[in-house]
């Protein structure tokens, strides 16, 4: 059947459209298009004549329309007129006529909207806002956003007019957001620039800090008040209920006991003409003066610089207390006290020297305590650590490699591929990577104050394919009922899997065996002799499946309890005595002999060639294993008779 | 024993969508990726996309793109693909593929294929 | 994508014969696989991640190559092996096939 398709269907004005003839049949005269649903002289937009190749344009033709020799109809620059039905009227060479029908709509391109207000600062918890958008389009629908985020579910907010005027009822300062409105069309969507609503609020009661209200006398009593408020409280400061100054900071230095009062901070907003006040009440007592600490160094470098505090004010006949991390000081070759204790000296200082210090000065009732002094120990950068610690990644993803080294002050950081230097930020981030992204990527740390920078390089592999895994081992020859072995399986990938056999099969159930790290890590615990096996692992990911070469652990362990043989334990006098030592043990261990307790020779056999009864008495053989640690012994009486004397003892060999 | 058993019609019409059914049986398909693959006939072989069952992770060739939508359903054991708008040049069999650990080896299982001819 | 170049395309050989089939990738890639597919049939795996024979493959076939170049031998055809046989690199998606070689007896 013959059918037309509009592509589109929906067209933008300006652009084109293509009224498409699907199963045109064969052996044609020729054909015509028109406007409209049916067939009308008055509207023919063009005709073609198939024989002659011949386009004859109608009382509708624009200029705008082309017709294909498959009958297919463009129609360009589209005006909204454009819109509706248009007939194929089909003439086939046996003079039967054949019509489809198609149509298409036109939507004009919208332009980019804004949002009007009728309120542009509106009063917390008073005042309503309504927000329009601009400009009034038909066949359009609009949407609202608050912070790039459709619109919250609020019985405060109302969309009407079409949803083309958004209000919000009872503002609060939470409304303080970004609102944008989007107008869309079958054919174009476009989105305002965003209006930031300036809610009007406070002054809430204000919070004067800090809370304490005793002081001694001589210190400094500053204040400061804060109320939350927009615009921004104006504050007023009253003592004992007379005006002070207009600030939100009071400070009054070296106080004395006549300061002790009521005091009282005034917030007050311009725009909302509300005030609110608070009161705290201050209480200075006459006291001796309060220790301080003075530093020769603020800023010591680790391992290099020495530091000396000293408490202050020097006064006579006065016992000098210090106090680190509020405990009493360490013991440490690094911490040097002088003679009257008054000052601390921190040789070679470290970043875990940074503190707290407190020196005390001990009258006869109390002590009183210095404020806490921070050392500000600069160190490092340490060799930085990039992580994630993947080193395979598949193609498409995103790459974001972020690098850290301990430093103080905090380190810079660059990122150079290959060599070259990419950016001077902490975090490096690539997306949709390729194979071309595989390269070495190297972070470099640098501390300003100390001049010192390290660099750590890690191989980026981009790869859908996983290379042939390997194992790493955290120990090559651990020792028996002693150490543990964890089996690492490398690389670390994304979206892998990992399996592991021993001896060609899977692994045994064991409270021993324990896998970890999404099954990269196999860590065998308390290894035994039996543990010395052929570890394999495997990778799985979605286009590969390897497995790595064997590891064979090689488990240290004894010397178990040496076996001397022959078991004899008596022999005829002029016979040779051969004696061999044998005990279980990786590495072989070491022999050696004792007689009588006497030491003899390092060897695993012993001979005494024509023994006599002088070589009676206890035979030890001693056992050790360097690798292990271990040793171990066995002891052995021998009996050797005069000849004749007792028949069917042995002879020797 | 590990199979992949396809099913799906084996003639669709131009302009409408090819649906075909992948059921594994001796493995779960959750631990492992589904991979689809197609060959015209008298033609090579050609990727189509894969799936990871356990979190509908997909990976598509961008040939397919936008045409192609896997699908797996762990319940049933079975992976799916669907191709929208086929013309006659998607005249082809379509294969459904899995590699897996079978004990200590890596093995490759394929289904049986099915031809799917695009024709009005 | 990477483009894969099997050749020859066909080739015809006596049984005994030594039998090569090369396959170059347009950029390099970590390893390559091979496939062979009897007529009617699904593709089976024949060889992985280069060198690997998979399982119940003969001794008589190998495979080699790294980077761009990779070749699959069979040391001596016998009638059993006639197939096609094709390349696959998984190094990067998309994944891609060689147009297959396909092997017959003389």
């Known amino acids: 059947k013959l059918t037309i398709e509009s592509t589109p269907f929906n067209v933008a004005e300006g652009k084109e459209v293509l009224l498409l003839v699907h199963n045109l049949p064969q052996h044609l005269f020729g054909y015509s298009w028109y406007k409209g649903e049916r067939v009308d002289g008055n509207r023919q937009i063009i005709g073609y004549v198939i024989g002659t190749q011949q386009a004859t344009p109608g009382p509708a033709y624009s200029g705008r329309e082309i017709i294909y020799p498959n009958a297919s109809l463009l129609i360009q620059n589209i005006i909204q007129n454009d819109t509706g039905f248009y007939t194929l009227h089909v003439i086939k060479s046996d003079l039967v006529n054949e019509e489809a029908t198609g149509q298409f709509r036109v939507y004009p391109e919208l332009p980019k909207p804004s949002i009007s207000s009728n309120n542009s600062k509106p009063v917390e918890d008073k005042d309503a806002v309504a927000f329009t958008c601009e400009p009034e389009t038909q066949d359009a629908t609009y949407l609202w956003w608050v912070n790039n985020q459709s619109l919250p579910v609020s019985p405060r907010l109302q969309l009407s007019n079409g949803n083309r005027t958004l209000t919000l009822f009872n503002v609060t300062r939470n409304d303080t957001a970004s609102y944008k409105c989007e107008t869309q069309n079958p054919v174009s969507a476009r989105r305002s620039d965003s209006v930031i609503l300036n809610v009007l609020y406070g002054p809430d009661a204000p919070t004067i800090s800090p809370l304490n209200t005793s002081y001694r006398s001589g210190e400094n009593l500053n204040l400061s008040c804060h109320a939350a408020s927009n615009p921004p409280a104006q504050y007023s400061w009253f003592v004992n209920g007379t005006f002070q100054q207009s600030t939100q900071e009071l400070f009054i230095p070296n106080i004395t006991v006549n300061n002790s009062g009521s005091y009282t901070c005034q917030a007050h907003n311009s725009d909302t003409g509300l005030n609110r006040t608070t009161v705290t009440t201050i209480t200075v007592y006459a006291e001796p003066p309060k220790p301080f600490i003075t530093s020769n160094n603020s800023n010591p470098v680790e391992d290099e610089d020495a530091v000396a505090l000293t408490c202050e004010p020097e006064i006579q006949n006065t016992t000098y207390l210090w106090w680190v991390n509020n405990q009493s000081l360490p013991v440490s070759p690094r911490l040097q006290l002088s003679n009257d204790n008054r000052t601390l000296t921190l040789l070679s200082v470290t970043r875990n020297d940074v503190g707290p210090y407190e020196c005390g000065i001990q009258n006869e009732l109390s002590v009183d305590h210095s404020d806490p002094v921070i050392l500000n120990v600069l160190y490092g950068p340490d060799d930085p650590t990039i992580s994630p610690s993947y080193t395979y990644y598949r193609p498409g993803v995103n790459l974001s490699l972020s690098c850290h080294a301990a430093s103080n002050p905090p380190a810079q950081y660059s990122w150079l591929i290959d060599g070259n230097i990419q950016q001077h930020t902490q975090e490096l981030f690539i997306s949709n990577i390729t194979e071309k992204n595989s390269g070495l990527y190297t972070c470099q740390a640098n501390n300003s104050a100390s001049g010192h920078s390290r660099t750590t390089v890690k191989t980026i592999t981009v790869s859908a394919e996983l290379p042939k895994p390997s194992i790493s081992s955290n120990n090559s020859k651990p020792v028996e009922d002693k150490d543990a072995v964890a089996f690492t399986c490398e690389p670390e990938a994304q979206n892998t899997t990992y399996l592991w056999w021993v001896n060609g099969q899977s692994l045994p159930v064991s409270p021993r065996l324990q896998l970890s790290n999404g099954n990269r890590t196999l860590t065998l615990f308390n290894v035994t002799r039996n543990d010395a096996r052929a570890y394999v692992c495997g990778i799985q990911n979605s286009v590969s499946a390897n497995r790595s070469d064997p590891v064979t652990l090689d488990v240290l362990y004894g010397p178990d309890t040496p076996i001397i043989s022959p078991p004899d334990s008596s022999y005829l006098s002029g016979a040779n005595l051969n004696l061999s030592c044998h005990s279980a043990s990786n590495p072989s261990p070491q022999y050696s002999w004792r007689i009588n307790g006497i030491p003899q020779q390092h060897t695993q056999v012993l001979f005494i060639a024509k023994i006599t009864p002088n070589n009676n008495g206890t035979y030890a053989c001693f056992v050790s294993n360097l690798a292990t640690g271990r040793n171990n012994s066995i002891v052995k009486s021998i009996t050797v008779s005069a000849s004749g004397t007792s028949p069917g003892l042995s002879a020797g060999a | 024993e590990v199979q992949l058993q396809q099913s799906g019609p084996g003639l669709v019409r131009p302009s409408q969508t090819l649906s075909l059914t992948c059921t594994a049986s001796?493995?779960?398909?959750?631990?492992?990726?589904m991979h689809w693959v197609r060959q015209p006939p008298g033609r090579g072989l050609e990727w189509i996309a894969w799936?990871?069952?356990?979190?509908?992770?997909?990976e598509y060739a961008p040939k397919f793109r936008g045409r192609a939508t896997m699908l797996a359903d762990s319940s049933k054991n079975q992976a799916s693909l669907r191709l929208s708008s086929v013309t006659a040049a998607d005249t082809a069999v379509y294969y459904c593929?899995?590699?897996?650990?079978?004990?200590?080896?890596?093995?490759?299982?394929w289904g049986q294929g099915t031809l799917v001819t695009v024709s009005s | 994508d990477i483009q894969m170049t099997q050749s020859p395309s066909s080739l015809s050989a006596s049984v005994g014969d030594r039998v090569t089939i090369t396959c170059s990738a347009s950029s390099s890639v970590t390893y390559m696989h091979w496939y062979q597919q009897k007529p009617g049939k699904a593709p089976k795996l024949w060889i992985y991640s280069t060198s690997n024979l998979a399982s119940g493959v003969p001794s008589r076939f190998s495979g080699s190559g790294s980077g761009t170049d990779y070749t699959f031998t069979i040391s001596s055809l016998q009638p059993e092996d006639i197939a096609t046989y094709y390349c696959?690199?998984?190094?990067?998606?998309?994944?891609?096939f060689g147009q297959g070689t396909k092997l017959e007896i003389k």
């Open positions: 593929h899995v590699l897996i650990y079978a004990g200590y080896l890596a093995m490759d299982y």
């Open positions: 001796g493995f779960n398909i959750k631990d492992n990726y």
């Open positions: 696959q690199q998984r190094s990067t998606y998309p994944l891609t």
């Open positions: 799936i990871d069952p356990e979190n509908g992770d997909t």
